[in-house]
């Protein structure tokens, strides 16, 4: 059965992806993109690392773990329904066609509204000010520099349980993990 990660609208989503560097500090470039992994690179890139640092990122997307130890898990801040979909984590191992690629499914749930007799899908009724945007409103303009300091314990990982599978006790075991070297 398929593995999916979940978050609620307004929360932070966590998409696990890991590799084991051959030696400390011997990093491999990684890219994260929206949509399934293409043959090369990432499509619709949201974040990229090189051999030393995070060298490209877009608003709301960051690496919260220690990427220098191979934790390249993606955190998406303040998600909306429009963030639902497939995300590609690509570990760009040197050599022809050596890349490891992982397609992770992220499902965003509407925020709980009380009372809620049925699952709210047509947002006109639940949030009149949102009209029928269904999570497809204007893109956020917040910059990375203005994001609050958030640590792992504050990230609502419970809202990102593995859908249709056991809730992993260890997120590292549930994520995309490879060993290099």
């Amino acid at each position: 059965s398929e593995v999916e990660y979940r978050a609620e609208v307004g929360q932070n989503a966590y998409l696990p992806c890991f590799y084991t560097p051959a030696a400390p500090g011997n990093l491999v470039p990684v890219c994260w993109g929206k949509g399934a992994c293409p043959v090369f690179e990432c499509g619709n890139v949201v974040l990229r690392t090189d051999e030393r640092d995070v060298n490209y990122w877009t608003s709301r997307y960051w690496l919260n773990g220690d990427f220098r130890k191979g934790d390249v898990s993606l955190t998406i801040e303040n998600v909306t329904l429009a963030d639902s979909g497939i995300y590609c984590c690509r570990i760009q191992i040197p050599g022809i066609m050596n890349d490891e690629k992982f397609n992770l499914k992220l499902v965003i749930k509407p925020a709980k509204v009380t009372p809620a007799p049925t699952r709210q899908r047509d947002f006109t009724a639940a949030f009149p000010r949102m009209l029928t945007t269904r999570g497809h409103g204007p893109a956020e303009t917040q910059t990375l520099g203005s994001l609050p300091d958030i640590n792992l314990t504050q990230i609502s990982t419970l809202a990102n349980e593995l859908r249709d599978s056991r809730l992993a006790n260890d997120l590292r075991d549930s994520g995309a993990t490879i060993r290099i070297g």
Partner: antibody
């Protein structure tokens, strides 16, 4: 692997009713709503409505409300659609489809079931 | 309801050609557009969602773009197996609505 399997083709007389089933497997049935579409010969796809098996919440396309009745059975992971007062213009291929989850694009479709209304 | 107007309704192409299909929404749907491929006697297959995001298993030659009311679907190099009808669909609001389809044929 997610699979949606529809019941077989139906040939019915005008005014009659027909009930088709869509059996889901490969995922937790109550975690996703089930959508229904139809496609008349040579025409575009048309959304009929959805049912939420978790709480039996239902939403219909206002344009064709009253034609279809959606139900589901959690114990067998099966969704049903009953079409009533059938007329020749209801002849179409009918599909069930599962969305990605709270967003209305459809990665998973049943194979389609043909309903022919003919006297 | 949002009306999705797709063009052309049919087109003839050769293997290796680049093909572009357009879809226009009757109102702003931001990037909430999906594209499907349907072969004769088969169910639609999701190719692109949210205007430009490829679904799992979809070849790189299929791409989508656009926002607001104007959307484009491109096959960079048509293959024989791409012969099908292609539909756009808005997933911005209920009810989801589909374009009229583009029938792609090989010369």
């Amino acid at each position: 692997e997610v699979q949606l399997v529809l019941s077989g083709a139906e040939v019915v007389k005008p005014g009659a009713s027909v009930k088709m089933s869509c059996k889901a497997s490969g995922y937790t049935f109550t975690n996703y709503v089930m959508h229904w579409m139809r496609q008349k010969p040579g025409q575009r796809l048309e959304w009929i409505g959805y049912i939420d098996p978790d709480n039996d919440g239902i939403k219909y396309n206002e344009k064709i409300k009253g034609k279809a009745t959606l139900t589901s059975d959690k114990s067998s992971s099966t969704a049903y659609m009953e079409l009533s007062s059938l007329r020749s213009e209801d002849s179409a291929v009918y599909y069930c489809a599962r969305d990605f989850g709270y967003v209305d694009w459809f990665p998973y479709w049943g194979q389609g079931t043909t309903v022919t209304v003919s006297s | 309801d949002i009306v999705m107007t797709q063009s052309p309704s049919s087109m003839s192409t050769s293997v290796g050609d680049r093909v572009t299909i357009t879809c226009k929404a009757s109102q702003d749907v931001t990037t909430a557009v999906a594209w499907y491929q349907q072969k004769p006697g088969k169910s639609p297959k999701l190719l692109i969602y949210s205007a430009s995001n490829r679904y799992i298993g979809v070849p790189d030659r299929f791409t989508g773009s656009g926002s607001g009311t104007d959307f484009t679907f491109t096959i960079s190099s048509v293959q024989p197996e791409d012969i099908a009808v292609y539909y756009c669909q808005q997933h911005y609001s209920i009810p989801p609505t589909f374009g009229g389809g583009t029938n792609l044929e090989i010369k």
